[in-house]
Amino acid sequence: AWELTILHTNDVHSRLEQTSEDSSKCVNASRCMGGVARLFTKVQQIRRAEPNVLLLDAGDQYQGTIWFTVYKGAEVAHFMNALRYDAMALGNHEFDNGVEGLIEPLLKEAKFPILSANIKAKGPLASQISGLYLPYKVLPVGDEVVGIVGYTSKETPFLSNPGTNLVFEDEITALQPEVDKLKTLNVNKIIALGHSGFEMDKLIAQKVRGVDVVVGGHSNTFLYTGNPPSKEVPAGKYPFIVTSDDGRKVPVVQAYAFGKYLGYLKIEFDERGNVISSHGNPILLNSSIPEDPSIKADINKWRIKLDNYSTQELGKTIVYLDGSSQSCRFRECNMGNLICDAMINNNLRHTDEMFWNHVSMCILNGGGIRSPIDERNNGTITWENLAAVLPFGGTFDLVQLKGSTLKKAFEHSVHRYGQSTGEFLQVGGIHVVYDLSRKPGDRVVKLDVLCTKCRVPSYDPLKMDEVYKVILPNFLANGGDGFQMIKDELLRHDSGDQDINVVSTYISKMKVIYPAVEGRIKFSTGSH
């Protein structure tokens, strides 16, 4: 028998520095977690103690904090190189700055192979990107070889900016021939490493013949055997065992997100490459694990540029950006409109001639808007200003909801109106009329939404049974501010870009902004 230790991360999302327990900015260092310096300590400890160790990443290193905004992926390559990762799969967010923003910062600068079997380049890009990412890589581990085959969510064109010259194929269809190829090369231990979410990970384990282990990402899935060490609730045991169609027991793992845990899986193979046993658990990277001093020093060196960036002008406003709770928790506020407009702008994807865009709607809890921005400071808007407006380090995500769920959400928005509560929704691509004289749960008297399957966008009444795409904060997607109906009834949820980054990019693009209060949210009394 031959034993392999798989260490794995996924959806790190730019958390290079240690964070608080909820993966936001670290405030009290003695209670902070994660970060590459702490990760390195644990990885090195395991490498010294065990003979056959692979360190793998299942994608979405890009996007999430000011580190990515400033360094654009160079920080990912630098610190992953320093940790000596063995391989990485491409995630959807690796395409956030287009293909050019992936090639030089990461693909060419990484010292490790970057993988995806289901992304195929065409046209002029094919020659430019040839060999920069691979469908699979055979890695020598001790006296054996292990094949790693990569995959990426086929939804990436809707979630990021891969352009028109990359085709995202069905994962299972694309993986099978690559695994077959590895078999012909006499590679009998094969790991599928990828970024398509837990449901797809399980399908790959079930359907792709020859895959021995699946290491996934995208869905931020937390798996754990025994009593979990922090706040995350396990979605199942670690590893999650899937019985394949050909009768094998295939372990599937994921390690939550944000570098809070290091996945730790021990696999025992027989001489023919069959999995005999698998066990392990994610390791919580809490403050009991010291930060490596040399990596920490490097982090501090790279940090300097971030502090300078925070005070640079992104653009100008010529109007007061009203982000006060007195406005945003009671009525339409222009800060809410600005943020929603930025959210939609960030999700412009012309993927189908029938649609001017795949999504037109935005909702945003007024309680998430934490500060106004005064235009009387020469109109200057900085990252620092935006960090005061959006201090929670959230993301703006894409969900699919039925009209009936949206209607419930808008009823919830005003069910206890007047108490300055955070659930009052700011909107984009939506016209809503409330009648507060009616009883809670029956106050939405008009709800019109902007069409997407149209060449000239216009507002049509919401249809209860229709499925709509909506951009909203991850806080709402997770049922925050009492929006349990969103969490319970959403049909799809894909995590998006860092909230501040979305707004800062929009302001930089527009250069000068002047958002108005324009009648997106109205109040009426009496008949309609």
């Epitope: 654009k72 160079a74 090639i103 030089e104 060419k108 600068e109 990484a110 010292k111 020598p140």
Partner: antibody, heavy 119, light 107 residues
Framework: QVQLVQSGAEVKKPGSSVKVSCKFS????????FSWVRQAPGQGLEWMGR????????DYAQKFRDRVTITADESTSTAYMELSGLRSEDTAVYYC????????????WGRGALITVSS | DIQMTQSPSFLSASVGDRVTITCQAS??????LNWYQQKPGKAPKLLIY???SLETGVPSRFSGSGSGTSFTLTISSLQPEDFATYYC?????????FGGGTKVDIK
Amino acid sequence: QVQLVQSGAEVKKPGSSVKVSCKFSGGSFTSYSFSWVRQAPGQGLEWMGRIIPVLTTTDYAQKFRDRVTITADESTSTAYMELSGLRSEDTAVYYCASGLKKNWYFDLWGRGALITVSS
Amino acid sequence: DIQMTQSPSFLSASVGDRVTITCQASQDISHYLNWYQQKPGKAPKLLIYDASSLETGVPSRFSGSGSGTSFTLTISSLQPEDFATYYCQQYDDFPLTFGGGTKVDIK
């Protein structure tokens, strides 16, 4: 196909500066990094530094940090290496090199420029 | 800086010989090592990257092995066109450093 064309040989006086150019063609300039490697007559290879134009980042060998400046001009797809305070031991062939697949291995080289430092 | 020590510095061999060149790193560099061939008056040519991966178009008689601090370039059957100088290069850390070179000439 992708290639690097370097400027020609030069003779320089001690204490002066030299600026060697490396013109890139046949691909997307922003998808590459450019390293400078020198080789004194009958000696081995010595890496001086590099630039990643799209990120405007440079890395230099400590030995040359005070005297070398590597720059790039995206409009002409050209990388430059300027070495100041020349001395006789700087007489060498100066190569510009790049990687087609990774920035860490050089599968693309210019023909080299012989810089002779002599009074 | 990481020191790369190549041995031997000079090597005389005949066509058809099996030739082995070693490269020692002053610290662990994992598999972050490349091999180049250089002929007089020409730029170096990449042969092997990542310690053991054969560059496209390079004959299969060239192979590389090793990890950590000890690396080897092997030419299984020396051909007339292989008489040249060979360099190893580490890319574990800046500055990138080369070995002193091994000159292979005709016995």
